[in-house]
Interface confidence: medium
């Protein structure tokens, strides 16, 4: 969901109250407060659906809940893409879609979500203890990955308990740096607020004379995110046959969607909202990375600091690939 938060303009303090230093110390807390409030953690959700008609066929759907623009999506199986997983599909908003068997059809559903149909046959059916992972590379958040596993289960539809923190790869120097600054800023803000606790509060009102205040991009967490308190770790457990409605979804919706945990099964907000589809679990892995494309199996040319492109030298193209033009 994309929202915008407006930083309120500050009425200058009365002369003699705190002087120039006072003005700085009053502006800073509000700027930092805005940053702290608007720096929402992005999330990746994963849904795994088993086709009722074809029990060895699965649909994986993934979405990104964040305010950044998505530059690449990688779907892999067997674990996260850089840690033993192998790529099933790579979707680039401009460069096209690449997919590998047994992926049958990968496509964009919205600007921030994708779906992938996976066909299994006999021994290679994806039921065989397979973990599916979706990684979204976005700017400025970096790479976020969530995974859901499909172990064989004799109890279809029952949700697996959240798994203890499996991976959080913190090699995202730039973004972690920003996070560090924000964290420091928030701590400093608390310190300033404590210092100003016993002082008269400054009068805050929108400035009528000054130009519009700077606008900060913000990500407003969905109800589900707030309800789940950002517990990011849950495995998606399905079996090789459709689950029954009552065991799978006390909240309703199609019975074959594996959406866990149930406490997070609210409707998604914004672009990821589909009719009668509960919001899925946070994946069983969440990872943050900097080499946005490197982990997707691309080895792009060096294109300047922090900018990586697919190795197509001819510039941006329309969505093309084996599945046709979007």
């Amino acid at each position: 969901m994309r929202t915008e938060a407006q930083v309120p303009a500050l009425q200058p303090p009365e002369p003699g109250l705190e002087g120039a230093m006072g003005h700085r110390t009053l502006v800073l807390p509000w700027v930092l407060l805005t940053l702290c409030v608007t720096a929402g953690t992005p999330e990746v959700w994963v849904q795994v659906r088993m086709e009722a008609t074809e029990l060895s066929s699965f649909t994986i759907r993934c979405g990104f809940l964040g305010s950044g623009s998505i530059s690449l999506v990688t779907v892999s199986w067997g674990g996260p893409n850089g840690a033993g997983g192998t790529t099933l599909a790579v979707l680039h908003p401009e460069r096209g879609i690449r997919q590998w068997a047994p992926a049958r059809q990968a496509r964009w559903e919205t600007q921030s979500s994708i779906s992938l149909i996976l066909e299994g046959s006999g021994a290679s059916s994806p039921c065989a203890n397979t973990t599916f992972c979706c990684k979204f590379a976005s700017f400025p958040e970096g790479s976020w990955e969530a995974c859901g596993s499909l172990p064989p289960s004799s109890d279809p539809g029952l949700s697996a308990p959240p798994t203890p923190a499996p991976i959080l790869r913190a090699d995202l120097a730039g973004i972690l740096g920003v996070s560090g600054v924000l964290l420091f800023g928030c701590v400093y803000l608390l310190h300033l607020l404590r210092r100003h606790k016993h002082r008269p509060a400054p009068r805050l009102q929108p400035s009528r004379t000054s130009p519009q205040a700077p606008r900060a991009r913000a990500w407003a967490p969905s109800q589900a995110s707030q309800a789940a308190l950002h517990v990011p770790y849950a495995t998606i457990n399905t079996s090789c046959r459709p689950a029954t409605l009552d065991t799978a979804h006390p909240h309703g919706g199609p019975s074959w969607w594996a959406s866990l945990p149930t406490h997070a099964a609210h409707r998604p907000q914004g672009p990821a909202a589909w009719a009668s589809t509960p919001i899925p679990a946070r994946g069983s892995f969440v990872s943050v990375e900097n080499g946005l494309y490197a982990q997707a199996g691309e080895r792009p040319p060096h294109t300047g600091p922090g900018l990586t492109l697919f190795p197509d030298p001819r510039g941006p193209r329309a969505m093309e690939g084996p599945l046709g033009v979007r």
Epitope: W77, G84, G96, W100, F310
Partner: antibody, heavy 120, light 107 residues
Framework: EVQLQQSGPEPVKPGASVKISCKAS????????IHWVRQSHGKSLEWIGY????????GYNQKFKSKATLTVDSSSSTAYMELRSLTSEDSAVYYC?????????????WGQGTSVTVSS | DIQMTQSPASLSASVGETVTITCRAS??????LAWYQQKQGKSPQLLVY???TLAEGVPSRFSGSGSGTQFSLKINSLQPEDFGSYYC?????????FGGGTKLETK
């Protein structure tokens, strides 16, 4: 040294099945996909499918989906391809080859090939 | 499936000459193309991947170029060991397909 050692030549009768092996050494078996490629006498190469040793997941060329079954035994770093309902059309040299998981390096090492001859 | 069309099917050349083999994809495969060399009775060997990156140990007289649907493999100053068959293969996604091959023979 990376090596893919394939099983020996297989003379088989029409309608029978055959299982050929590809033993990998010199690298971490689960870090690479194993692909299978067919080459009929004097012809080009045809991709049959691949298997991902990490979890045994396989992907097939539709043309070979009912003909070939790919499996792995990670404990012995060996990949297998079973060919069934063989006909004279299936007489060919079958190669295994490895490819880095992210599939952008090409098939960099190949087995020596297994010749399958179907004749009554 | 993506079709790969290679030309010429056969080619005669002498040691020291420069030859070019071309490969055309039936649809855009960006730079996801590999070239292989195969000598009589031997397994194929990777020469080039991602259209222009030389595989490890491949002599610099080999070079790949192209993107989209048109690709070529150029061999400068042919050496005796370069004679054999050459195949292009897309790695844009499965099913992988190979070109029909180019047989490079001595003149």
């Amino acid at each position: 040294e990376v090596q893919l050692q394939q099983s020996g030549p297989e003379p088989v009768k029409p309608g029978a099945s055959v299982k050929i092996s590809c033993k990998a050494s010199g690298y971490t078996f689960t870090d690479y996909n194993i692909h299978w490629v067919r080459q009929s006498h004097g012809k080009s190469l045809e991709w049959i499918g691949y298997i991902y040793p990490y979890n045994g997941g396989a992907g097939y060329n539709q043309k070979f989906k009912s003909k070939a079954t790919l499996t792995v035994d990670s404990s012995s770093s060996t990949a297998y391809m079973e060919l069934r309902s063989l006909t004279s059309e299936d007489s060919a040299v079958y190669y295994c080859a490895r490819e880095e998981l992210r599939r952008d390096y090409g098939m960099d090492y190949w087995g020596q090939g297994t010749s399958v001859t179907v004749s009554s | 499936d993506i079709q790969m069309t290679q030309s010429p099917a056969s080619l005669s050349a002498s040691v020291g000459e420069t030859v070019t083999i071309t490969c055309r994809a039936s649809e855009n495969i960006y730079s996801y193309l590999a070239w292989y060399q195969q000598k009589q009775g031997k397994s194929p060997q990777l020469l080039v991947y991602n259209a222009k990156t030389l595989a490890e140990g491949v002599p610099s007289r080999f070079s790949g170029s192209g993107s989209g649907t048109q690709f070529s493999l150029k061999i400068n100053s042919l050496q005796p060991e370069d004679f054999g068959s050459y195949y292009c293969q897309h790695h844009y996604g499965t099913p992988y397909t190979f070109g029909g091959g180019t047989k490079l023979e001595t003149k």
